[in-house]
């Protein structure tokens, strides 16, 4: 058993049929010694008396809020949550496996630049009685500070018969050094509580691996005289790290016809312009990627050929 926060405790249980469970001793937080009784949740049934209560925790029916009283007055509470371990593996019932970039990906994180600011998000099908708490650090043995805000519900998605809830959190490394080579990864830890079930999820990454630039801005077309060609130009996104001579991007320019089946023409360039053939009813799209490290491409910026 360990303390998650004040008066909230997590009991770790091996979860299999007829498992013996864990013996837990609860102590009433009071100087009183006599006349103390214990109840669970809203029940008035007295479970025991005395300053301590010993219980065998085997299932969710044994978890909940234990309260010690004296003469009708509440003295203290202890909330017991369960953390299930099945076949040696901690349960992951609360969050949905996003399966990208690989199986068992519960947390996904992205950074728009090297400032040390990043966003993580996760999915669940659970709509009520759900709380999240997020902590982060750089490194784990001698951790350096990363400050995370509160996790908030950011979107709801209906996919077929399923409803998914997307939560996100923003974090900022306290003393980020954008140009420094990272040697220790960022660690993100999410505590999830659904009713009386506790689970924890972790992700470990270098900022360089989660970089996803914003799309290029000011995408413009300039027709070239007596030609079907156009000059496409764009600029670095405002959110990208500076100076751009050091934090450089590379770009992919794509000409896409109206039909998805039409062949796509693609050009790769380090410049902020390119010359392409603009077909009727086609659109031109440009996306960006860190020039020196193959992290994610940005979303596409697009403009119609017409």
């Amino acid at each position: 058993i360990w303390e998650l926060k004040k008066d909230v405790y997590v009991v770790e249980l091996d979860w299999y049929p007829d498992a013996p469970g864990e013996m837990v001793v609860l102590t009433c937080d009071t100087p009183e010694e006599d006349g103390i009784t214990w109840t669970l949740d809203q029940s008035s049934e007295v479970l025991g008396s005395g300053k301590t209560l010993t219980i065998q925790v085997k299932e969710f029916g044994d978890a909940g809020q234990y309260t010690c009283h004296k003469g009708g007055e509440v003295l203290s509470h202890s909330l017991l949550l369960l953390h299930k371990k099945e076949d040696g593996i901690w349960s992951t019932d609360i969050l949905k496996d996003q399966k990208e970039p690989k199986n068992k990906t519960f947390l996904r994180c992205e950074a728009k630049n090297y400032s040390g600011r990043f966003t993580c998000w996760w999915l669940t099908t659970i709509s009520t009685d759900l709380t999240f708490s997020v902590k982060s650090s750089r490194g784990s043995s001698d951790p350096q500070g990363v400050t995370c805000g509160a996790a908030t519900l950011s979107a709801e998605r209906v996919r077929g018969d399923n409803k998914e809830y997307e939560y996100s959190v923003e974090c900022q490394e306290d003393s980020a050094c954008p140009a420094a080579e990272e040697s220790l990864p960022i660690e993100v830890m999410v505590d999830a509580v659904h009713k009386l079930k506790y689970e924890n999820y972790t992700s470990s990454f270098f900022i360089r691996d989660i970089i996803k630039p914003d799309p290029p801005k000011n995408l413009q077309l300039k027709p070239l005289k007596n030609s079907r060609q156009v000059e496409v130009s764009w600029e670095y996104p405002d959110t990208w790290s500076t100076p751009h001579s050091y934090f450089s991007l590379t770009f992919c320019v794509q000409v896409q016809g109206k039909s998805k089946r039409e062949k796509k023409d693609r050009v790769f360039t380090d410049k902020t312009s390119a010359t392409v053939i603009c077909r009727k009813n086609a659109s031109i799209s440009v996306r960006a990627q860190d020039r020196y490290y193959s992290s994610s491409w940005s979303e596409w910026a697009s403009v119609p050929c017409s």
């Epitope: 966003t119 950011s154 979107a155 914003d214 799309p215 290029p216 996104p237 979303e299 697009s302 403009v303």
Partner: nanobody, 123 residues
Framework: EVQLVESGGGLVQAGGSLRLSCEAS????????MGWFRQSPGREREFVTS????????YYADSVKGRFIIATDDAKNTVYLRMNSLKPEDTAVYYC????????????????WGQGTQVTVSS
């Protein structure tokens, strides 16, 4: 050309809720980023929220964070803006828009716009 059609606006008392809908005419549109903006008389069009249909990277204006929430329905090719704890200052015409290029927060970055739906919050 993709068309966006908003609905669901109306008159509501402060503290109340509304759900705006935006239906996209083309199925392929659900692969894109979209946004909601609002405009009240004599003011510039203001960013409300921006999101990607495929997930992640959802952004909200500070003034609506925690009160407004994006919801999407793939089968109906529709995006919803659920507005809770409405305030008189939320009164505006609300537009849904399809992203084109540039900053997610700028109206200039969106190339396809709906006709707008009026939301009035009375005190």
């Amino acid at each position: 050309e993709v068309q966006l059609v908003e609905s669901g606006g109306g008159l509501v008392q402060a503290g109340g809720s509304l759900r705006l809908s935006c239906e996209a005419s083309e199925r392929t549109f659900s692969t894109y980023r979209m946004g909601w903006f609002r405009q009240s008389p004599g003011r510039e069009r203001e960013f409300v929220t921006s999101f990607n249909w495929s997930g992640g990277s959802t952004y909200y204006a500070d003034s609506v964070k925690g009160r407004f929430i994006i919801a999407t329905d793939d089968a109906k090719n529709t995006v919803y803006l659920r507005m809770n704890s409405l305030k008189p200052e939320d009164t505006a015409v609300y537009y849904c828009a399809g992203y084109s290029s540039g900053s997610y927060y700028s109206p200039r970055s969106y190339g396809v716009w709906g006709q707008g739906t009026q939301v009035t919050v009375s005190s």
